[in-house]
Interface confidence: low
């Protein structure tokens, strides 16, 4: 569901990944938006905490982008996906082993709830910097 | 050491459109809010509205039919349209950056007098 | 809109002597991150408004000790530990929680 608002970023999770004066989109789909997506990164954060050391800054990075999208604030607020070309970056360049044990353990059901579902874009359905260059976020 | 600097007509008649300009030196107009704020002759301060980089804009309700901005980050400028004037507009109007870091005004211009008198 | 109301509106004090204004907003500035969107700011005669005091409590740069924000939620204070001459003008709280903005009625602070 896209239907949000932006605003600035006032959490603590991502402060230092997101840019400082980035503006955020805040999914309304949820009864208090910055609380649940703040609970969604810190989450799956945690789980970051054993991933190798050149693995953890680019997927925290993913991450933070990730559930708290750049925000174009027209007349209808939207969010700004990340570019395919970074996250498959992440997937298959900085994160390959972590990102294949994540989905092995998704297929066994090793997960107990679906919140890291929510905090793993699929790279594939995003969309490329190539084709539109203001369509998606660049990390 | 950013600085702000406010131009524009110091008289305006009644029902015709303010024009203001802020011109910000000595730093950056990007990844800033840009904000207008108004007083009339010995009253309080009143928030107009702002303006971000991308061009985005969030306006006072109370003035929202009446207030266009604009941005030039070419020439770093920013500028303030008010429409159908009447003498109740009649005061110093500000610009002023707005700090992300401190969520605070932290740079002002020295104030631009506009009358709105025919 | 959220409203903001400050006391005394005249506040005439002796140099060396401590000041304190009072601002009272009507709905909580306090944001779940810890923060109170709270900002204080003078202007003295003739000249723009200058920021003092961010978040609540914190001096902006320049500003000399003797000034100090308190407060949480919807009752904050500014107080100057000793006014000195330079004080004199007109001191304004500010919401920064939510647009519009808005601004305290101000509060004019001259030396006896």
């Known amino acids: 569901d896209n239907k949000g608002y932006c605003a600035q970023y006032r959490g603590e999770v991502c402060n230092a990944v997101l840019a400082k004066d980035a503006l955020v989109f805040l999914n309304t789909s949820y009864a208090d938006p910055e609380e649940a997506q703040e609970l969604l990164v810190h989450t799956a954060w945690n789980e970051l905490k054993v991933v190798s050391p050149v693995c953890r800054p680019a997927a925290e990075a993913l991450l933070c982008n990730h559930i708290f999208q750049e925000c174009s604030p027209g007349v209808v607020p939207t969010p700004i996906p990340i570019c395919r070309e970074y996250c498959l970056a992440v997937k298959e360049l900085f994160c390959a082993k972590e990102w294949l044990v994540m989905e092995e353990k998704t297929h066994r059901g090793l997960y107990r709830s679906e919140m890291h579902l929510l905090s793993v874009p699929e790279c594939s359905k995003l969309p490329s910097m190539h084709w539109d260059p203001t369509a998606c976020a660049r990390l | 050491q950013v600085q702000l600097q406010e131009s524009g007509p110091g008289l305006v008649k009644p029902s015709e459109t303010l024009s203001l300009t802020c011109t910000v030196s000595?730093?950056?107009?990007?990844?800033?809010?840009w904000t207008w704020i108004r007083q009339p002759a010995g009253k309080g301060l009143e928030w107009i509205g702002r303006?971000?980089?991308?061009?985005?804009?969030d306006y006072n309700p109370s003035l929202k039919s009446r207030v266009t901005m604009s941005v030039d980050t070419s020439k770093n400028q920013f500028s303030l349209k008010l429409s159908s004037v009447t003498a109740a507009d009649t005061a110093v109007y500000y610009c002023a950056r707005y700090n992300w870091n401190d969520d605070a005004f932290d740079i002002w211009g020295q104030g631009t007098m506009v009358t709105v008198s025919s | 809109d959220i409203v903001m109301t400050q006391s005394p509106l005249s506040l005439p004090v002796t140099p060396g002597e401590p000041a304190s204004i009072s601002c009272r907003s009507s709905?909580?500035?306090?944001?779940?991150?810890?923060?109170?969107?709270l900002d204080w700011y003078l202007q003295k005669p003739g000249q723009s408004p200058q920021l003092l005091i961010y978040l609540g409590s914190n001096r902006a740069s320049g500003v000399p000790d003797r000034f100090s924000g308190s407060g949480s939620g919807t009752d904050f204070t500014l107080k100057i530990s000793r006014v000195e001459a330079e004080d004199v003008g007109i001191y304004y709280c500010?919401?920064?929680?939510?647009?519009?903005?808005?601004f305290g009625q101000g509060t004019k602070l001259e030396i006896k």
């Open positions: 303006i971000y980089t991308s061009g985005s804009t």
């Open positions: 500010m919401q920064a929680l939510q647009i519009p903005h808005t």
């Open positions: 709905q909580s500035l306090l944001h779940r991150n810890g923060y109170n969107y």
């Open positions: 000595g730093g950056s107009i990007s990844s800033y809010y």
